[in-house]
């Protein structure tokens, strides 16, 4: 019981429970396929406890195994729009440091306007996650349609 009380008084970060849930801020300029994210209580249901945003990209502050999840909905889209603009692809990966650059998730919009996925993956302090949307379709900024997050699971 004393442990439970102590837990409640400690911030999540100090327990290693790093977690972030982000909403889309904007897309990049024309030759930049990255999505730029934002988070914080002032924005509603988004937050950062541990990880931080660096120019709209999520940077990890604690080593560990994380659950990474993402959903992206295309904004001006109906059943066949995505197929008429094929290929539209979403990729999540470690984009810096360059020595750790790797793709973690790759998804294609084929017949639908929404894609969602998650996976467990080891991440290290200093890893920056980038989400690249390639193709000509734009993502929705509605917070229930497009979101991105990570959750520390274990060391």
């Amino acid at each position: 019981q004393r442990f439970a009380q102590a837990q409640q008084q400690l911030p999540l970060e100090s327990l290693g429970w790093d977690v972030a849930e982000l909403q889309l801020n904007h897309t990049g300029p024309q030759q930049d396929p990255r999505l730029y994210w934002q988070g914080g209580p002032a924005l509603g249901r988004s937050f950062l406890h541990g990880p931080e945003l660096d120019k709209g990209q999520l940077r990890i502050h604690r080593d560990g195994i994380y659950m990474v999840h993402i959903q992206v909905t295309l904004a001006i889209c109906s059943s066949t729009t995505a197929s008429r603009h094929h290929p539209t692809t979403l990729a999540v990966g470690i984009c810096s440091p360059a020595s750790r650059s790797i793709s973690l998730l790759r998804l294609s919009f084929h017949q639908g306007c929404t894609i969602a996925s998650q996976r467990l993956t080891p991440l290290a302090r200093g890893d920056t996650l980038c989400t690249n949307l390639t193709g000509t379709l734009l993502p929705s900024r509605n917070t229930d349609e497009t979101f991105f997050g990570v959750q520390w699971v274990r060391p």
Epitope: I76, S78, T136, L138
Partner: antibody, heavy 118, light 107 residues
């Protein structure tokens, strides 16, 4: 058959507002992306705005951003364009157009003329 | 924004002749280009989509070709009802943009 009928055009002074409507029939309106496209007298076509099938996502041409608002009422099968702070350069025939599901336009209304003049 | 340049501005031809209209994009639009026909006092009509596909009900004398930045609309043998203004339109990037138009007039 597919029909799009615009209304609401007319003569208006600079700085004033106008709301255009487009009544749709002959297809399942709520399933389609819709656009407004305009054409100044004797000039070419200019895309103005687009709205998603559910009305939750919209994009605008830079020339009208912050002044025009596209909306739709799927229960009434009607598309709208609210035009505020009108300028002389907004004078044009305004067409509503149905999207092909790929950002080109397979059906157009007959157009409604908006004249902005003092 | 992507700029579409159409040429020539005016094409003077006789019925039965072949018409070749050009549309050039300021950057690649892949094959995401459409062509429209507009007659005086009427709304535009979709002729060709995705550079080379004829829209429903469009006669076979209309054909489109090209990809990347250079596109062509060909009318193999002009009928009297084909004299009109023709516009190209790209759907690769927002804002969607149209070319300035080519007027096909009777010589």
């Amino acid at each position: 058959q597919v029909q799009l009928v615009e209304s609401g055009g007319g003569v208006v002074q600079p700085g004033r507002s106008l709301r255009l409507s487009c009544a749709a029939s002959g297809f399942t309106f709520s399933s389609y992306i819709m656009h407004w496209v305009r054409q100044a007298p004797g000039k070419g076509l200019e895309w103005v705005a687009v709205i998603s099938y559910d009305g939750r996502n919209k994009y605008y041409a830079d020339s009208v951003k912050g002044r025009f608002t596209i909306s739709r009422d799927n229960s009434k099968n009607t598309l709208y364009l609210q035009m505020n702070s009108l300028r002389a350069e907004d004078t044009a025939v305004y067409y509503c157009a149905r999207d092909t599901d790929g950002y080109d336009f397979d059906y157009w209304g007959q157009g409604t003329l908006v004249t902005v003049s003092s | 924004e992507i700029v579409l340049t159409q040429s020539p501005a005016t094409l003077s031809l006789s019925p039965g002749e072949r018409a070749t209209l050009s549309c050039r994009a300021s950057q690649s639009v892949s094959s995401y280009l459409a062509w429209y026909q507009q007659k005086p006092g009427q709304a535009p009509r979709l002729l060709i989509y995705d550079a080379s596909n004829r829209a429903t009900g469009i006669p076979a004398r209309f054909s489109g070709s090209g990809s990347g930045t250079d596109f062509t609309l060909t009318i193999s043998s002009l009928e009297p009802e084909d004299f009109a203004v023709y516009y190209c339109q790209q759907r690769t990037n927002w804002p969607l943009t149209f070319g300035g138009g080519t007027k096909v007039e009777i010589k």
